[in-house]
């Protein structure tokens, strides 16, 4: 139960006080008691409940006509059952007794009022009155947790605008309102109550730039909503009529959790006594609601795909046809960014990561725009953000970034349990250097901080700086599986490729050619690849780098060897000893449910079939997956990327609600 104020009573004159329903009000009967009195009794109107405790140990008793010793150990508290119809209509009489004096009476006239700030603290999608039931001032995680949730209103419901909805002080329409969380102020007071009292709604100065509150006028159009709290306004005096009244507020978050903002916002209503014009207003009562800003959540490959994105560039029509066919099979919408909009930047995966935000009443896809800002720079803002599609970005928008700030270097695992700790939304994975040096690359700290601050997908730092491009999607992927943990981790494996090629040579296929059928590309015999000492040394180094990540992933995702599939792949070390795929990198695949779009490796053809394709199919088809090999050689591979790098996917949000987890 909420804490009310302390009321001091005195026999000299009647005391007038306000008691808010649902609060516990302390009654000080001692400090002004007549000197010779040693005991007291209390009588109250039927609407007032008086509790007297004499402790320690406390003996609690509701009032009757019994007398109590007048000493500091006696605690008297009041609660009110009903709101007053008129000012001071509830009475409490205290009678003081002494051995030699007649009883002395002190009168207290109480006005019971109902004032409660309600939000969806039970996370049901509906606002229910919570008076005297739960403490709204705390926010707790887990299935038994409580606390309201706010969405960053980061979509653009107004197609005429170039800004996010949270960047203006207006409510566009009911669509815009649905992105906000409802908070209701319920009051029930005597008619004349607000001639001497005022209600003020306020937010801490440290939080005022993170939230905006609109007041709705009931029965009017939503456009009648007016801003009452926000970056310029930490407090607002409310014009409340007496009697029974409900006032609706719509609350939007303006910022995602980050290093300097844990994501909690407290909105408070204060009841002020303004009866004495000579004196400052006095606080009578406060009620608060704590909201947590919904985190941005990534979706792993195991979530069903809903929309595929790719770029149209010079001569990639065949690639797009393959992706289109795959999207149709997976029943996905397909969005192609035309040449005139991508400015010859085909790396859709690197430009953005599509996740979502969720409150009990609303789920919203949100695109996280990377700071790489090349030709696709405008695509997330102009073509992805829109009605019910949010936008967020972090990091420097001009320079100061590295290749590791592209989002091919940002992935998320499926849900895992690690040494008893559950990660029901998976864990974020991104690449880094293994130690800082003058020329090592790392994901920009602003991006790392943002990802960590979301709390629900605790990030894991992998080692990817050994790669020329430096992205985790160059050596790992996840695919759905019907058994075990519901997925497999795929890792690029030089060892597995050498093993396969050695087996083929042993069977007399040493003359079979890698890159057969690719014009203008020097072909390589299996026997030459196997005998090339430098290439072996390079791949031995690569294997060590991938093995480092393998052990890290096993430890941080709680995986066993049987959860991992090795995909045959060779690399070569290029300038500054950075690795690139020697043939199209098959692990860099597009995963659309059970349909996989895998870079066509152009491996040695043996008995009419590419032995690399055959090997991969034999590894993945038993899991119910269908492998489509896509020719990306000249349009993507030789430009240092593959199918995954050139595509992006919006996926279905988790059915698991983020607030039910315990980070």
């Amino acid at each position: 139960m909420a804490q009310g104020t302390l009321i001091r009573v005195t026999p000299e004159q009647p005391t007038h006080a306000v008691c808010v329903l649902g609060t516990l009000t302390q009654l000080d009967i001692c400090s002004s008691a007549p000197e010779d009195c040693t005991s007291f009794s209390i009588n109250a109107s039927p609407g007032v409940v008086v509790d007297i405790a004499h402790g320690p140990p406390a003996k609690k008793k509701s009032t009757g006509s019994s007398t109590w010793p007048l000493d500091p150990g006696v605690e008297v508290t009041l609660t009110m059952k009903v709101a007053s119809g008129s000012t001071g209509d509830q009475k409490v009489q205290i009678s003081y007794y002494g051995p030699k004096t007649p009883p002395v009476k002190a009168l207290l006239y109480l006005t019971g009022v109902e004032i409660s700030l309600c939000a969806d603290i039970t996370r049901t999608g509906k606002v229910k009155p919570t008076r005297a039931v739960k403490d709204q001032r705390t926010w707790t995680w887990g299935p038994c947790g409580q606390g309201a949730i706010l969405l960053v209103n980061c979509d653009r419901d107004n197609l005429e605008s170039s800004a996010m909805d949270c960047e203006d002080d207006e409510v566009l329409d009911s669509e815009d309102l649905q992105d906000m969380s409802l908070m209701t102020l319920s009051t029930k007071t005597p008619k004349d109550f607000f001639t001497n009292h005022t209600l003020v709604l306020h937010v801490a100065r440290s939080e005022m730039d993170k939230v905006r509150v609109f007041q709705a006028t009931r029965g009017k159009l939503s456009s009648k909503c007016s801003v009452v709290l926000g970056p310029k306004w930490p407090s607002h005096y409310l014009m409340v009529p007496g009697g029974k009244h409900n006032m609706d507020f719509y609350v939007e978050a303006l910022a995602f959790p980050d290093t300097d903002f844990p994501g909690l916002i407290t909105l408070t209503i204060s009841l002020l006594d303004t009866s004495n014009l000579e004196l400052p207003e006095a606080v009578v009562f406060q009620d608060s609601v704590v909201f947590r800003v919904a985190p941005w959540i990534m979706t792993p490959n195991t979530q069903p795909p809903q929309e595929v994105y790719a770029c149209s560039i010079f001569e990639n029509e065949d690639f797009l046809k393959s992706v289109t066919t795959l999207a149709m099979k997976a029943k996905c919408k397909l969005t192609i960014c035309p040449e005139e909009e991508n400015m010859d930047d085909q790396w859709m995966q690197d430009e953005m990561e599509i996740g979502y935000i969720q409150a009990p009443h609303k789920t919203l896809p949100v695109v996280f725009d990377s700071p790489r800002n090349r030709g696709l720079k405008e695509f997330p803002i102009k073509r992805v953000m829109g009605p019910d599609f949010g936008y967020v970005t972090r990091g420097p928008q001009t320079g100061g970034i590295s290749g590791l700030d592209s989002f091919g270097n940002l992935e998320v695992s499926p849900p895992v349990t690690v040494r008893g700790k559950e990660y029901p939304l998976g864990r974020i994975l991104f690449g880094d250097s293994c130690y800082p040096s003058n020329d090592s690359r790392q994901m920009h700290q602003a991006l790392q901080d943002f990802l960590s601050a979301q709390q629900v997908q605790a990030p894991v730092k992998l080692y990817s700086d050994w790669l020329s491009v430096g992205h985790v999607d160059e050596f790992l992927s996840f695919v759905p599986a019907p058994d075990r943990k519901g997925f497999r981790l795929l890792l690029a494996s030089p060892r597995s490729c050498y093993k396969l090629f050695q087996e083929q040579q042993n069977e007399g296929h040493g003359e079979a050619l890698l890159f057969e059928g690719i014009k203008k590309k020097k072909q390589q015999k299996i026997k030459n690849i196997l005998s090339n000492k430098t290439l072996r040394e390079h791949n031995s180094f690569v294997e060590r780098c991938i093995d480092w990540n393998r052990e890290l992933l096993k430890r941080e995702l709680g995986l066993a060897e049987s959860d991992i599939i090795d995909i045959p792949q060779l690399f070569k070390l290029k300038e500054f000893s950075k690795a690139e795929a020697f043939f199209p990198n098959m692990v860099n695949m597009l995963v659309l449910g059970k349909h996989l779009g895998i870079p066509k490796p152009f491996g040695p053809v043996i008995n009419g079939r590419c032995c690399l394709e055959e090997k991969v199919c034999s590894l993945l088809e038993p899991l119910g997956l269908q492998c489509t090999f896509i020719n990306d050689f000249f349009t993507y591979h030789i430009r240092h990327g593959e199918v995954h790098c050139g595509t992006n996917v919006r996926r279905k949000p988790f059915s698991f609600k983020w607030w039910n987890m315990v980070p």
Epitope: S468, K522, K574, K578, H640
Partner: antibody
Framework: QVQLVESGGGLVKPGGSLRLSCAAS????????VSWIRQAPGKGLEWVSF????????YYADSVRGRFTISRDNAKNSVYLQMNSLRAEDTAVYYC?????????????????????WGRGTLVTVSS | QSALTQPRSVSGSPGQSVTISCTGT?????????VSWYQQHPGKAPKLIIY???ERPSGVPDRFSGSKSGNTASLTISGLQAEDEADYYC???????????FGGGTKLTVL
């Protein structure tokens, strides 16, 4: 064969900034590793910076690290050298140079470590 | 002071052979096969004449040859010609924090 033309040099006070550009013609610069090399008046060559074709990693000489930034815009067929906090000892002719990234080599050819195409250079003078 | 050491000058008569040395350490010339040589005529940009220790770009006469032994690389020009008079610079990849090093340059005079 690609041809390179540097621009953006000039006289600048110590502590000032300049942005050098290296524009390519005759071929697509995105197929080339690019380095900047400088030569102080009457002195030898000094390697300054490097950027790879994928535009994903860069390297710098100790003498310029933290002050100079190399970048490329493949759409504009250009590479840039942003030079901040310039010092008198940065006075030199700045050459843009490149090497083709040959995808056919079975193993690394070391093409990022040598420069087979050079521009004519642009003079940067840092003086008060 | 340059990281790779070259003689300040060498000379030779037309038709003769000259060798220019380039001495580094086990962290550059001795470690990598990424040694290259450049020719620079006065007022002109340098020109690549040898890469990967001994390979010649197309158009470079076979009078120019490169080799390496231990921490020292060498450029040999046989059958000297007047137009060979120029400054010559060696370069190597290095494992130091500056990944490409140049020698101080050698002035070749054709007598």
């Amino acid at each position: 064969q690609v041809q390179l033309v540097e621009s953006g040099g000039g006289l600048v006070k110590p502590g000032g900034s300049l942005r050098l550009s290296c524009a390519a013609s005759g071929s697509t610069l995105s197929d080339y590793f690019v380095s900047w090399i400088r030569q102080a008046p009457g002195k030898g060559l000094e390697w300054v910076s490097f950027i790879n074709t994928a535009n994903t990693f860069t390297y710098y000489a100790d003498s310029v690290r933290g002050r100079f930034t190399i970048s490329r815009d493949n759409a504009k067929n250009s590479v840039y050298l942003q030079m901040n906090s310039l010092r008198a000892e940065d006075t030199a002719v700045y050459y843009c140079s490149s090497a083709n990234d040959d995808v056919d080599d079975i193993v690394a050819p070391g093409r990022g470590y040598y420069m087979d195409v050079w521009g004519r250079g642009t003079l940067v003078t840092v003086s008060s | 002071q340059s990281a790779l050491t070259q003689p300040r000058s060498v000379s030779g008569s037309p038709g003769q052979s000259v060798t220019i040395s380039c001495t580094g350490t086990s962290g550059d010339v001795g470690r990598y096969s990424h040694v290259s040589w450049y020719q620079q005529h006065p007022g002109k940009a340098p020109k690549l004449i040898i890469y990967n220790v001994y390979e010649r770009p197309s158009g470079v006469p076979d009078r120019f040859s490169g080799s390496k032994s231990g921490n020292t690389a060498s450029l040999t020009i046989s059958g000297l010609q007047a137009e060979d008079e120029a400054d010559y610079y060696c370069s190597s990849h290095s494992r130091s924090s500056t990944p490409v090093l140049f020698g101080g340059g050698t002035k070749l005079t054709v007598l």
